[in-house]
């Protein structure tokens, strides 16, 4: 070996200085008598080496690196050899930090594996090989006096936890536990824990199960779940408290917590839930009142709450067939009485014959919002209910009676916008209990079965805004019927458009007769079109050769017009404008020439 490096310390604090010397022996005959020693850190040449010849003929170079900022690097001592750099010796330098104090040391006792598992946070990176050791001792008191030492627990590389097996534990007796971290730059120790392994016991959670329905037990109420749990047998003798958490399977709801529950409440009815909803449930337990750790949450149990009978008001309306008055068409609408009013599976219309106690005859059972049935001759009323698997809504009586109440007056309708109509009226005296408003297409598309209807519960209302099934350019028939205690008033109707179309074209003008100073014009009116409002008037316009304009307004029933006061032998442009409430349209232009003074008049 020609050269040898020695360093002040091969491992230093990151950023600290380091001093190195390189000695080249004299007997390296192939070297220059006065070789220049160079220093290289990693790939970079380092200036600042101080070189001297020693008394024994060896050459020495000393360099001080003011800050070692690499966590690992090779320092080389080199000579120029021809055109290349010859490395004579190199050393590995390392830089880093002494270990920080390990923190957040915590332990839990696992009764299944019979071991005490401790974990900690090692602190920031030291950049140096650092070993951690979990150290412990048995103590009779509060860890002030140290008893028998327990074998050190050394975690696997890179792990920040370690298991102390049961043979080194004493339950119901305190242990002192701490973590020691060590590297080349120093040693640190975590604060000491003093604990009884049983006080950090982490139990296994119970297993949640659905309760087997027993014939004598009442079924759960709507919005309730009956469940039970099977405790983890090995922890059965440990007093515990438990908590349950639940959330609906659908939606973004967060977990709701129920507790504390004693472990021994092996069966439980959980209420206040949404009816007919699938829930996910979990349970966990903790040693209590003595100290311990919460168990993990149990595997999920998925259960569905029973539904509740529908809580709805049924608004009803009916019509008799004109050809067969005993055939009744009954319509209804469910109005929820609560936020969660229960699912509706279907509807039943039934009749109870008088004198037949308990006998109820179903007239129809449907999922629709209407049904048609033959009303028995002695039946004056029927009952309507909504139902689901949990039961029925309160029956709504429907009384079939003649129209004996007073009629409303001044029924009128007006467009609000292209998709709504306002219908107004003057209420009769006495006030009705409410009104039924029906609407549908008027003639020629009118149909009784396609009508929409609404119940207005306020008998003092003087109008109603129709917003459903209203389209522009359609004629609607609107029928309003006042409702009284046991009867109704006569129905009134009115027709209206929510938006009408302007006439699509005006009639063509034809010249019938012409003279020197007059011209007789005629036209054939356009037939009325559905969705177009009737014409209100015509306006006829004429313009002479000097661009002077004249006009006359004619009523909508006009079929012709005579222009007077024209100039002889003059050119005129004439057109007709047909107007309705929705707008106006012009006809094509008719051009004509009046006769010369000497010419004979044309008829």
């Amino acid at each position: 070996e020609c050269g040898h490096i020695s360093v002040s310390a091969p491992i230093v604090h990151l950023g600290d200085p380091i001093t190195a010397s390189c000695i080249i022996k004299q007997n390296c005959s192939h070297l220059d008598p006065e070789p220049q020693i160079l220093w290289r850190l990693g790939a970079e040449l380092q200036p600042g080496g101080r070189q001297q010849r020693l008394s024994d003929g060896t050459q020495e170079s000393i360099i001080t690196l003011p800050h070692l900022n690499h966590t690992q690097a090779f320092l080389s001592c080199c000579l120029n050899w021809g055109n290349s750099l010859q490395i004579l010796d190199q050393v590995e330098l390392r830089a880093g930090y002494p270990p920080a104090i390990p923190h957040n040391l915590s332990c839990l006792m696992n009764l299944t594996t019979s071991s005490l598992i401790c974990q900690w946070e090692p602190g920031p990176e030291t950049h140096l090989p650092t070993s951690f050791t979990l150290k412990s001792f048995k103590s009779r008191g509060n860890c002030q006096t140290q008893g028998d030492s327990i074998l050190d627990c050394v975690p696997k590389d890179g792990q920040s936890h370690c298991c102390i097996p049961r043979k080194h534990l004493l339950l119901y007796q305190n242990m002192g536990i701490w973590v020691q971290a060590e590297n080349a730059l120093g040693t640190s120790m975590s604060p000491q824990l003093c604990l009884d392994p049983m006080d950090v016991v982490k139990l296994e959670p119970p297993m949640l199960r659905t309760m087997d329905p027993s014939p004598e037990a009442a079924p759960p109420q709507a919005g309730c779940l009956q469940l039970c749990w099977e405790p983890w047998q090995p922890g059965l003798h440990i007093n515990q408290k438990c908590e349950l958490r639940h959330k609906p399977q659908r939606g973004e709801a967060s977990w709701a917590l129920v507790g504390p529950l004693p472990l021994e409440a092996l069966q439980y009815e959980l209420c206040g839930l949404l009816p007919a909803t699938a829930y996910t449930l979990q349970i966990r337990c903790i040693r209590w009142p003595l100290p311990g750790h919460w168990s993990d949450w149990s595997p999920s149990l998925e259960l569905r709450t029973t539904e509740r009978a529908p809580t709805v008001r049924l608004d009803t309306w009916w019509r008799q067939r004109q050809l067969d008055p005993r055939t009744v068409q009954l319509f209804w609408k469910p109005v929820p009485l609560e936020e969660d009013s229960g699912r509706i599976q279907g509807y039943v219309v039934s009749w109870r014959p008088s004198g037949q106690a308990g006998a109820i005859l179903p007239l129809c059972n449907t999922t629709e919002l209407s049904c048609t049935f033959h009303l028995p001759s002695e039946a004056q009323e029927v009952a309507l209910v909504a139902y689901n698997s949990a039961g029925t809504s309160r029956p709504t009586p429907v009384v079939f009676s003649e129209s004996r109440g007073p009629a409303l007056t001044r029924l009128h309708a007006m467009a609000r916008d292209p998709h709504s109509l306002w219908v107004g009226w003057e209420p009769p005296n006495p006030w009705p209990q409410g009104y039924v408003i029906e609407w549908g297409l008027g003639p020629p598309s009118a149909s009784n079965s396609n009508k929409t209807w609404r119940m207005e519960q306020n008998g003092r209302a003087t109008g109603f805004l129709l917003k459903e099934n209203i389209r522009p350019f359609q004629l609607y028939e609107i029928i309003v019927t006042p409702l009284y205690q046991d009867t109704m008033g006569p129905s009134q109707h009115v027709y209206a458009y929510s938006q009408e179309m302007a006439p699509s074209h005006a009639p063509e003008l034809h010249l019938k007769h012409i003279g020197k100073t007059w011209a007789q014009l005629e036209w054939v009116p356009e037939p009325p079109e559905l969705g177009k409002s009737p014409l209100t008037h015509y306006t006829i316009f004429w313009t002479n050769a000097q661009n002077q304009s004249f006009s006359a307004i004619l009523n909508a029933s006009s079929r012709g017009f005579v222009l007077h006061g024209l100039e002889p032998a003059s050119l005129y442009h004439i057109h007709l404008m047909a107007a309705s409430q929705a707008g106006a349209t012009n006809s094509t232009v008719l051009t004509l020439m009046t006769l010369t003074p000497e010419g004979s008049e044309l008829h």
């Epitope: 009764l111 019979s114 049961r166 339950l171 047998q233 090995p234 059965l236 003798h237 007093n239 004693p262």
Partner: antibody, heavy 118, light 107 residues
Framework: EVQLLESGGGLVQPGGSLRLSCAAS????????MGWVRQAPGKGLEWVSS????????PYADSVKGRFTISRDNSKNTLYLQMNSLRAEDTAVYYC???????????WGQGTLVTVSS | DIQMTQSPSSLSASVGDRVTITCRAS??????LNWYQQKPGKAPKLLIY???NLQNGVPSRFSGSGSGTDFTLTISSLQPEDFATYYC?????????FGGGTKVEIK
């Protein structure tokens, strides 16, 4: 000092009934599981039944299920064993025991002898 | 049910001897194994719980080991007062079960 004192043993005919009591002192009775263990003359130990701290959980040995009922009165610090339909094979010394958190029987009473014979 | 098999059923030993009694469970019971000592006409007394934990007041010559299915009670140096019957008991799950007992007699 923990003390468990059994009483209620004696001679009873087959098919008859007996009620054993165990008076506990020296610890917070309501916090611990309790149990009954029996030992037939010249035989080994046999667990009979246990009861949780509040009385909600009561496991039984198959040999006594449906005939024996374990109960407790936390206000009186007393454990009971109601024995019905007694058989000759139920003849034994009955011990009352205080259970630890890991199911160990930490303290035992001195025992009471039950003899079932005609 | 979990069966507990104790062996030997009896043994003769002298004062100062090291005595070992084994207990085998028919299925894994983790560390839920307890040892009791019973002297004639007396109630049993807890020696070791949870396989290896010495009950307060019990001399340190008694020790327990094992886990899963195989367990051992060791008396490191038999004393005159140790001649008795020893029982193991599992408390892993109900029904709790005892071993048949090992009678330690004076040689």
């Amino acid at each position: 000092e923990v003390q468990l004192l059994e009483s209620g043993g004696g001679l009873v005919q087959p098919g008859g009934s007996l009620r054993l009591s165990c008076a506990a002192s020296g610890f917070t009775f309501s916090l611990y599981w309790m149990g009954w263990v029996r030992q037939a003359p010249g035989k080994g130990l046999e667990w009979v039944s246990s009861i949780s701290s509040s009385g909600g959980v009561t496991p039984y040995a198959d040999s006594v299920k449906g005939r024996f009922t374990i109960s407790r009165d936390n206000s009186k610090n007393t454990l009971y064993l109601q024995m019905n339909s007694l058989r000759a094979e139920d003849t034994a010394v009955y011990y009352c025991a205080k259970l630890g958190e890991l199911g160990q029987m930490v303290y035992w009473g001195q025992g009471t002898l039950v003899t079932v014979s005609s | 049910d979990i069966q507990m098999t104790q062996s030997p059923s009896s043994l003769s030993a002298s004062v100062g001897d090291r005595v070992t009694i084994t207990c085998r469970a028919s299925q894994g019971i983790s560390s839920y194994l307890n040892w009791y000592q019973q002297k004639p006409g007396k109630a049993p007394k807890l020696l070791i719980y949870y396989a290896s934990n010495l009950q307060n007041g019990v001399p340190s010559r008694f020790s327990g080991s094992g886990s899963g299915t195989d367990f051992t009670l060791t008396i490191s140096s038999l004393q005159p007062e140790d001649f008795a019957t020893y029982y193991c008991q599992q408390s892993f799950k109900y029904p709790m079960t005892f071993g048949g007992g090992t009678k330690v007699e004076i040689k």
